[in-house]
């Protein structure tokens, strides 16, 4: 993880990195590695990439082991094929409102994705996109024969839009806060990432937390019930200590993590907590990095890597964080 | 985010007319019905009356000659009226979104004394 | 009149599983009913946890759950936490109005 010890790279020839990725030195000047991406993970022999003006954001000078790859201040974005400089507001579609800050987009769904239950007055409620609106709207389907009625269909489960109010004023300063990015890595130890200027000088600030939606080696679709598609928060086990790049966390956490599904939904994370983890490493350093913890998750068809980069982004966020 | 807040007189007189209003913010009321509930001081809820999205009502039947409701879906407000109002009815009066009650307001204490 | 029972209170550890009923003078609950469960924690504002019967509101933890149980509408709290710790209210529609339960005081030891 450090560069104290003698050069030891691959007997491979230099690894093939993805469309747009740079084939770099790493930070001890040894080997040629994949450069890191903009909220990776990143470390003194994982460095960023440099070519995109990205920088390993260690957080804090005690945190010197593990960072993330963040662009060097007014760095702009590319989304949508747009370049958009850093401060810039901009509205994607007519759905989201998102901010570009050193690099990194931050979108607020303009459109309320509320859930409905089941009632007598909309006992089959779906949402629908209607002619010329933008947002989708509920919909009450009456049962096909009046006389008959049946039971009561599960609420068509797109998005909650519930929890704190992102946009509040303040002593001169209208605060907004975007919501969680979805994790960065459906399973294992992610990155998710925010944009803010809930601060004292009402400045917008980028804000990262690590993010494990469910373990890699976990065999999640085992433990279905029969006659069901999905497992939703599967029951776990017993308690866990995470990892990061070596280090470990010094508390056993009685983590939520989020199922899976058969039938081609997907399940994310629903409701949210961040909370402080401290993580030991094997010199000894011990660093604090936040954390998301899931408090609920939710299965839908709203699956990220669909087309639509707007609608991945937006059905991917995590809402109503509770820290 | 879903509000909805109840307003009106904290104190009414026996025999008098009580106008509550329920402000709703997040939703519209032409997609979803809203509910009245009471609840007297350390009792259970009492169910009063709903207006549904379409603008039907419904009322519990033991205040339905007492009771009317009725809404402004421009102004997203929901006005329930009770007439002759006794001290039996002082209590805490509570608008709630149709759809499993999901959302309440915070209510608001009407006590009835002369 | 129609009137819908609920168990005035019930106690249960941390961790442990309890089951909440309501009960309808009129006969079984069924799902046309709507049985709809709403909470009350102390100093905090009602909010439904559960509508048609078994649907979960998007803040309801999966240990929440709704089903009809011998004739009536059920409210399973399984890995009972501190926080649930609440009052418990379910009402039924009737065709033309609900009816509210006297609801339940849930107690966690502890």
């Known amino acids: 993880q450090n560069c104290s010890g003698p050069c030891r790279c691959p007997d491979e020839p230099a690894p093939r990195c993805p469309a747009g990725v740079s084939l770099v030195l790493d930070g001890c000047g040894c080997c040629r590695v994949c450069a890191k991406q903009l909220g990776e993970l990143c470390t003194e022999r994982d460095p960023c990439d440099p070519h995109k003006g990205l920088f390993c954001d260690f957080g804090s000078p005690a945190n010197r082991k593990i960072g993330v790859c963040t662009a060097k201040d007014g760095a702009p974005c590319i989304f949508g094929g747009t370049v958009y400089r850093s401060g810039e507001s901009f509205q994607s579609s007519c759905k989201y409102q998102c901010t570009c800050l050193d690099g990194a987009v931050g979108c607020m769904p303009l459109c309320s994705m509320d859930v409905r239950l089941p009632s007598p007055d909309c006992p089959f409620p779906r949402r629908v996109k209607l002619p010329g609106k933008c947002c989708e709207e509920w919909v009450c389907d009456e049962p096909k024969d009046q006389t008959v009625v049946g039971p009561a269909l599960a609420a068509y489960r797109l998005e909650d839009t519930f929890g704190p109010d992102p946009t509040m004023i303040r002593a001169n300063c209208l605060v907004q806060t975007t919501e969680w990015s979805a994790c960065s890595k459906t399973c294992g130890m992610g990155i998710s990432t925010r944009v803010t200027n809930d601060n004292a000088s009402c400045r917008l600030e980028k804000q990262s937390r690590l993010c494990m939606v469910r373990p890699c080696e976990a065999d999640l679709e085992e433990n279905i019930k029969k006659g069901k598609k999905c497992i939703r928060t599967p029951k776990i086990s017993k308690p866990i200590k995470f990892e990061l790049s070596g280090c470990t966390s010094m508390k056993t956490y009685r983590a939520k993590f989020c199922g899976v599904c058969t039938d081609g939904r997907c399940c994310t994370p629903h409701r949210t907590t961040t909370l402080p983890v401290e993580f030991k490493c094997p010199d000894g350093e011990v660093m604090k990095k936040n954390m998301m913890f899931i408090k609920t998750c939710a299965c839908h068809y709203n699956c990220p890597g669909d087309n639509d980069i707007f609608e991945s982004l937006y059905y991917r966020k995590m809402y109503g964080d509770m820290a | 985010e879903v509000t909805l807040k109840e307003s009106g007189p904290v104190l009414v007189k026996p025999t008098e007319t009580l106008t509550l209003t329920c402000t709703v913010s997040?939703?519209?009321?032409?997609?979803?019905?809203v509910h009245w509930i009471r609840q007297p001081p350390g009792k259970a809820l009492e169910w009063l009356a709903v207006?549904?999205?379409?603008?039907?009502?419904d009322y519990n039947a033991a205040f339905m000659s007492r009771l009317t409701i009725s809404k402004d879906t421009s102004k997203s407000q929901v006005v329930l009226t009770m007439t002759n109002m006794d001290p039996v009815d002082t209590a805490t009066y509570y608008c709630?979104?149709?759809?499993?009650?999901?959302?309440w307001g915070q209510g608001t204490t009407v006590t009835v004394s002369s | 009149e129609t009137v819908v029972t609920q168990e005035p209170s019930l106690t249960v550890s941390p961790g442990g599983t309890v089951t909440l009923t309501c009960r309808s003078s009129?006969?079984?609950?069924?799902?046309?009913?709507?049985a709809n469960w709403v909470q009350q924690k102390p100093g905090q504002a009602f909010r439904g946890l559960i509508g048609?019967?078994?649907n979960r509101a998007p803040w309801t933890p999966a240990r929440f759950s709704g089903s009809l149980l011998g004739g009536k509408a059920a409210l399973t709290l399984s890995g009972v936490q501190p926080e649930d710790e609440a009052e418990y209210y379910c009402?039924?529609?009737?065709?033309?109005?609900?009816?509210f339960g006297g609801g339940t005081k849930l107690t966690v030891l502890g």
């Open positions: 709630a979104r149709d759809g499993g009650f999901d959302y």
């Open positions: 997040g939703f519209s009321l032409s997609t979803f019905g």
């Open positions: 207006i549904w999205r379409r603008g039907g009502t």
């Open positions: 009129i006969g079984a609950v069924t799902t046309s009913n709507y």
């Open positions: 048609g019967t078994s």
């Open positions: 009402a039924l529609w009737y065709s033309t109005h609900y009816v």
